[in-house]
């Protein structure tokens, strides 16, 4: 005799109004009177539509959170499954179970705005900037809301900046406890005479921090070819051991690159008779600290004063 | 502590339309599917109808369908019960009930409102 | 649809007594009956789910059981709180029903 299971109940994909921060949720299957006393599990699968690969969850909780692009649908599926001591060491699963949850399409995808920029300057502030959609009437404009786990519901800008009177961008400080975790972002817009599109945007603010450029820098030569540069973390909430560093050294007509996570490096005079040497520094936030980011501004260059010329003895 | 305050209701012409509200607190409302229950004066209890959570699963009653739309307002807090083309046989006094689920499935109805007395009569 | 019947229609009893209603359903429900109580001008309130489980704050003297399409609620010593309408529930199918009701007064 085959064993069977239904598939849970309500399955649905639900929009708190987050900005894409989703709840998938279900209520238990009707179970026959044998299996009564089994664990259930579920087997979720969700994604975004135009994703080649599933997310996979197996859980006996009856909701699972997770953030999505909102600029694009939302597809779930869900079953049951049997613990194995229920079903004789056999595998019982219930069909699958599927909801899906669809972007609005009010307003034309050329109402939407355009080369949405964030950048978490120095670990402190976030600025966004926009570009009005292609094609708005004049009296189009635009508003952001952002959320992250932490806050009880979606926030719009206090802050933003402006261009012609139109909002183009937001400021945003004071993000309190904002990093590591996904931070939602909705740009939408109003117009008398026509519905504008909202664009969605995910990310987290750790791998998009710009920080300060370094500062204080210095430079020696010591036995006349070991080549010493130091330099100083800028100041701010970034901590030393989070930053890399990119070194320029220029030593006459000749420039070269090189790396380093320490603020400070050893090298050797490429010509022992060199004139100049001068060498210019920027920092980004490293590999241990977050997954990505962007490079700091370089800093002002610094050149050896310690040369004097062949006239000099 | 769970509350259900039903209003909307009050004497209807047949044919007429009414919508019912009912405003939920105390508990997470997206989290529960709700229904509505009516009863008609001295009579037993009629399921009208259920909507899920999120709202994606709705079911009526055969006496009701294509008559009456349940629909909610997870940000308000606030199921809503829309009753057109409104016949004497509606006359009721209108719950709204919170539905709960064991954990294999047995689906019950464990918080009640205190209802609203609907009047269907020329 | 699924058709519930309650027996009896009504019943007299006094305070102490013990007290058996029963619920049949047209087919098997398994486990998934309900019962509700209501008192006049109020609303219904749950005292068993899934037939035989005490929903929070219902006196013990409440129980039920049965399985399939035969179910009885029973108070072991009734009170003068429990003299009203008790109505059973199917929630098996997505289309619940209700049984007509049975009401216990004071004899």
């Known amino acids: 005799l085959e064993i069977k299971v239904n598939p849970p109940q309500d399955f649905e994909i639900l929009d708190p109004g987050l900005l894409g921060y989703l709840y998938l949720q279900w209520k238990p299957p009707v179970v026959i009177e044998k299996f009564k006393g089994c664990t259930l599990e579920y087997e979720l699968k969700y994604r975004n539509v135009d994703s080649d690969s599933w997310k996979t969850i197996i859980t006996r909780n009856l909701i699972y959170k997770d953030g999505f692009d909102l600029n694009k649908g939302i597809e779930g599926k869900i079953r049951t499954h049997l613990s194995e001591h229920c079903t004789n060491g056999s595998e019982v699963q219930s069909p699958w179970i599927e909801a899906s949850y669809g972007i609005s399409d009010e307003g034309s995808l050329e109402t939407k705005i355009q080369d949405m920029k964030c950048i978490y300057y120095n670990w402190q502030y976030l600025v966004c900037s926009w570009k009005p959609g292609k094609t708005v009437y004049s009296d189009t404009n635009y508003t952001m809301f952002f959320w992250y786990e932490g806050l009880d519901h979606a926030l719009q800008c206090a802050d933003y900046l402006q261009h012609d009177e139109k909002n183009v961008g937001c400021k945003l400080s004071n993000l309190d406890s904002s990093d590591y975790k996904d931070f939602f972002i909705c740009v939408n817009g109003s117009s008398k005479l026509e519905p504008i599109r909202s664009s969605y945007t995910v990310f987290q603010l750790q791998n998009i921090v710009k920080p300060l450029p370094p500062e204080f820098l210095h430079i020696s030569v010591e036995n006349s070819i070991d080549i010493r540069m130091k330099w100083s973390t800028p100041g701010g909430p970034i901590p030393p051991r989070c930053y890399t560093y990119e070194i320029v050294i220029r030593e006459d007509d000749i420039s070269w690159e090189s790396a380093t996570d320490k603020n400070d490096m050893k090298l050797k005079r490429r010509a022992n008779e060199s004139e100049d040497l001068c060498f210019f520094v920027r920092c980004k936030v490293n590999i241990y600290c977050a997954d990505d980011g962007i490079w700091s501004e370089w800093s002002e260059e610094e050149c050896w004063e310690g040369y004097t010329g062949p006239d000099s003895k | 502590e769970v509350q259900l305050l039903e209003s909307g209701g009050g004497l209807v012409q047949p044919g007429g339309s009414l919508r019912l509200s009912c405003a939920a607190s105390?508990?997470?409302?997206?989290?529960?599917?709700m229904s509505w229950v009516r009863q008609a004066p001295g009579k037993g209890l009629e399921w009208v109808s259920y909507?899920?959570?999120?709202?994606?699963?709705?079911y009526y009653a055969d006496s009701v369908k294509g008559r009456f739309t349940i629909s909610r307002d997870n940000s308000k807090n606030t199921l809503y019960l829309q009753m057109n083309s409104l016949r004497a046989e509606d006359t009721a006094v209108y719950y709204c009930?919170?539905?709960?689920?064991?954990?294999?499935?047995?689906?019950?109805?464990?918080?009640w409102g205190q209802g609203t007395l609907v009047t269907v009569s020329s | 649809d699924i058709q519930m019947t309650q027996s009896p229609s009504s019943l007299s009893a006094s305070v102490g007594d013990r007290v058996t209603i029963t619920c049949r359903a047209s087919q098997s429900i398994s486990s998934y009956l309900n019962w509700y109580q209501q008192k006049p001008g109020k609303a219904p309130k749950l005292l068993i789910y899934a037939a035989s489980s005490l929903q929070s704050g219902v006196p013990s003297r409440f129980s039920g059981s049965g399985s399939g399409t035969d179910f009885t609620l029973t108070i072991s010593s009734l009170q003068p709180e429990d003299f009203a309408t008790y109505y059973c529930?199917?929630?098996?199918?997505?289309?619940?029903?209700f049984g007509q009701g049975t009401k216990l007064e004071i004899k």
């Open positions: 909507i899920s959570g999120g709202g994606s699963y709705t």
């Open positions: 105390g508990f997470t409302f997206y989290s529960y599917g």
């Open positions: 009930a919170r539905g709960s689920y064991s954990h294999y499935g047995a689906h019950y109805l464990d918080y």
């Open positions: 529930q199917q929630a098996l199918s997505s289309l619940p029903t």
